[in-house]
């Protein structure tokens, strides 16, 4: 399906507010420094450039690659070199190679201010005055802090952080309609983002086969009706979707993401009955609606798997014809049988089930070799189901902030070499699993909870990844997609880490404490516990309660008191004292 | 070693009801669907209901209405509840359980609907 005129093609599939959206976010992503009216004179330069494409698709240029269009106009910033260093030396490239080098130079955490939320009036006002802008700058400021955010999916939130301004600006009260919303919006946007940076991880370090597996396995478990042929072509277009928008091809990736949702629709038959009301929607709100779609219910006699996987006498004939078919239908069965099962425990069972069919078809007797492989899944299933057990249970008896705190001690003494804010942002993030799961029924616990930690993790792997200072890290983080959370959970206290020295000014804290909202406090308070095991990793749990329990009444006295910095003063020295005693 | 024993059969009037119970002994990990099967002389095994391990339930037309099908997980125990039993409901019923490992069957109670 080739076009004389990419740029012109994606133009006139797209919409001319979609191709700027994502031109906008493209850009922001890749140059995350620069500031907002740059980009938009480049979208707006694009843009032109591509309508006269439209116009003529033989016009001079119009025949070049998007990522030569894209990234010419990349290399024009003045400010590259003083702003983005030697991200610089990337336009000395040619393509892919120019394309390749800015995709390495995106940075997952930007030093870049925290969004501060003005008044709701002069956000209204704003919004009012001029909308487009106020769109643009929406999917600017995201992007350029997310650099890996599902672009298509940003549009959506765009339109639903449009649509919030539009109703709650005409509310009487402005600001108790249009906050939650905002808070909703936020918290959604965050979840999007870290879990599109797994499937982007999961591509770029791992290949695309491991993509794949999860695509089958998670497709399976959510139409289990459907055919492994059906779900083996949705598993090909949705790898050649994200595969698009990890590259940074994100015309491509969201014109080829409406191709799917129109397949998908067409075929609802054959794929799920599910589907129905996600297809009445408009394109955006139909995308996601389909990519967040409950599981249809399980076919009610699906046979047992032993009769074709174990007691076949065609099992390595089979396999040695075409292993990853096999292996890929193997892992339908089984997911379409289990969505009670996390995606990540399937391709721990299928990887099982590989790894016994290489050892066992090369065997004298293969079929007594294999007989009791389903045998030996049993300890990987009852692993994470027990570890869901257990948390649950810590959770249900502390509490959300409380547990935060004992997953903080937990990793800091697994990792302590790894910075405290990172500490802190995973393990508030890994302590979020209990809200999110714990409360649901049985069957939708573990995945919930496992793939929801599978991204967390990812989250640390990537941060470490940029500033490498723990080899237990990477080493969870490379060798096994499937097994990084098995990894991190199996880590203990690391005997080789050489406590760090004792800093009074880590410990020192002043009245601007007590204005800060209850969720930084709790940073506040979480960052110095991460301090303090790191400064004693032995330290017992009683121990570390008590000084938390200390502090806790320490913010709280000063906070009273008429002279609060006063109070911070002549009170801090005293809890540092009596914490080094109750650490000794 | 995987037991099912079934129980709660036995003779009942048309429009009678009777609960039948399967309760399971051994370990079995790994239940994607539980179910109640039917045989009368001379004929297939047929589904009657089952539940499957996202809680979703299916039931034959035949007895759709009438019958329900229930778990309790802490006992390990399968249930079918039978209203409104009609002479054409008398057969041997069998309880299932499946794991992707196996398929585990108990050895039947006699249903007999007659006046």
């Known amino acids: 399906d080739t076009h004389k005129s990419e740029v012109a093609h994606r133009f006139k599939d797209l919409g001319e507010e979609h191709f700027k959206g994502l031109v906008l976010v493209a850009f922001s992503q890749y140059l995350q420094q620069c500031p907002f009216e740059e980009h938009v004179k480049l979208v707006n330069e694009v843009t032109e450039f591509a309508k006269t494409c439209v116009a003529d698709e033989s016009a001079e240029n119009c025949d070049k690659s998007l990522h030569t269009l894209f990234g010419d106009k990349l290399c024009t910033v003045a400010t590259l070199r003083e702003t983005y260093g030697e991200m610089a030396d990337c336009c000395a490239k040619q393509e892919p190679e120019r394309n390749e080098c800015f995709l390495q130079h995106k940075d997952d955490n930007p030093n870049l201010p925290p969004l501060v939320r003005p008044e709701v009036d002069v956000m209204c006002t704003a919004f009012h005055d001029n909308e487009a802008t106020f769109l643009k700058k929406y999917l600017y400021e995201v992007a350029r802090r997310h650099p890996y955010f599902y672009a298509p999916e940003l549009l959506f939130f765009a339109a639903r952080y449009k649509a919030a301004f539009a109703e709650c600006c005409q509310a009487a009260d402005k600001a108790a309609c249009l906050l939650p919303k905002l808070d909703e919006l936020r918290d959604e946007g965050k979840a999007s983002s870290a879990k599109q940076r797994l499937k982007c991880a999961s591509l770029q370090k791992f290949g695309d086969r491991a993509f794949k597996a999860w695509a089958v396995a998670r497709l399976s478990q959510k139409f289990p009706k459907a055919e492994f042929a059906e779900v083996s072509k949705l598993v090909t277009d949705l790898t050649k979707v994200h595969t698009e928008c990890c590259h940074g091809d994100l015309l491509e990736c969201a014109d080829d993401r409406a191709d799917l949702a129109k397949y998908m629709c067409e075929n609802q038959d054959s794929i799920s009955s599910k589907l129905k009301e996600c297809c009445d929607k408009p394109l955006l709100e139909k995308s996601h609606c389909l990519a967040e779609v409950e599981n249809d219910e399980m076919p009610a006699d699906l046979p047992s798997l032993a009769a074709d996987y174990v007691e076949s006498k065609d099992v390595c004939k089979n396999y040695a014809e075409a292993k990853d078919v096999f292996l890929g239908m193997f892992l339908y069965e089984y997911a379409r049988r289990h969505p009670d099962y996390s995606v990540m425990l399937l391709l721990r069972l299928a990887k099982a089930y590989e790894a016994t069919l290489e050892k066992c078809c090369a065997a004298a007797d293969p079929h007594e070799c294999y007989a009791k492989v389903f045998d030996e899944f049993q300890p990987l299933v009852e692993e994470p189901q027990n570890l869901v057990k257990q948390n649950c249970e810590l959770f249900e008896q502390l509490g959300e902030y409380k547990f935060q705190n004992a997953l903080l001690v937990r990793y800091t003494k697994k990792v302590p070499q790894v910075s405290t804010p990172t500490l802190v942002e995973v393990s508030r993030n890994l302590g979020k699993v209990g809200a999110k799961c714990c409360k649901l029924p049985e069957a939708k616990r573990m995945p919930c909870a496992e793939d929801y930690l599978s991204v967390v993790l990812n989250r640390l792997c990537v941060l470490h990844e940029k500033t490498p200072v723990s080899e237990k890290v990477t080493k969870c983080c490379t060798e096994s997609l499937v097994n990084r959370r098995p990894c991190f959970s199996a880590l203990e206290l690391d005997e080789a880490y050489v406590p760090k020295a004792f800093n009074a000014e880590t410990f020192t804290f002043h009245a601007d404490m007590c204005t800060l909202s209850e969720k930084e406090k709790q940073v506040k308070k979480q960052t110095a516990l991460v301090e303090l095991v790191k400064h004693k990793p032995k330290a017992t749990k009683e121990q570390l309660k008590g000084v938390m329990d200390n502090f806790a009444a320490f913010v709280e006295k000063c906070c009273k008191a008429d002279d609060k910095e006063a109070c911070f003063a002549e009170e801090g020295p005293k809890f540092v004292a009596a914490s080094q005693a109750a650490l000794a | 070693q995987v037991q099912l024993v079934e129980s709660g059969g036995g003779l009942v009037q048309p429009g009678g009801s009777l609960r039948l119970s399967c309760s399971a002994s051994?370990?079995?990990?790994?239940?994607?669907?539980m179910g109640w099967y039917r045989q009368a002389p001379g004929k297939q095994r047929e589904l009657v209901a089952s539940?499957?391990?996202?809680?979703?339930?299916h039931y034959a037309d035949t007895v759709k209405g009438r019958f329900t099908i229930s778990r309790d997980n802490s006992k390990n125990t399968l249930y079918l509840q039978m209203n409104s039993l009609e002479p054409e409901d008398t057969a041997v019923y069998y309880c299932?359980?499946?794991?992707?490992?196996?398929?585990?069957w108990g050895q039947g109670t006699q249903v007999t609907v007659s006046s």
């Open positions: 051994g370990s079995i990990w790994g239940i994607y669907h």
């Open positions: 539940i499957t391990v996202d809680g979703s339930t």
């Open positions: 299932d359980i499946r794991n992707v490992g196996g398929d585990y």
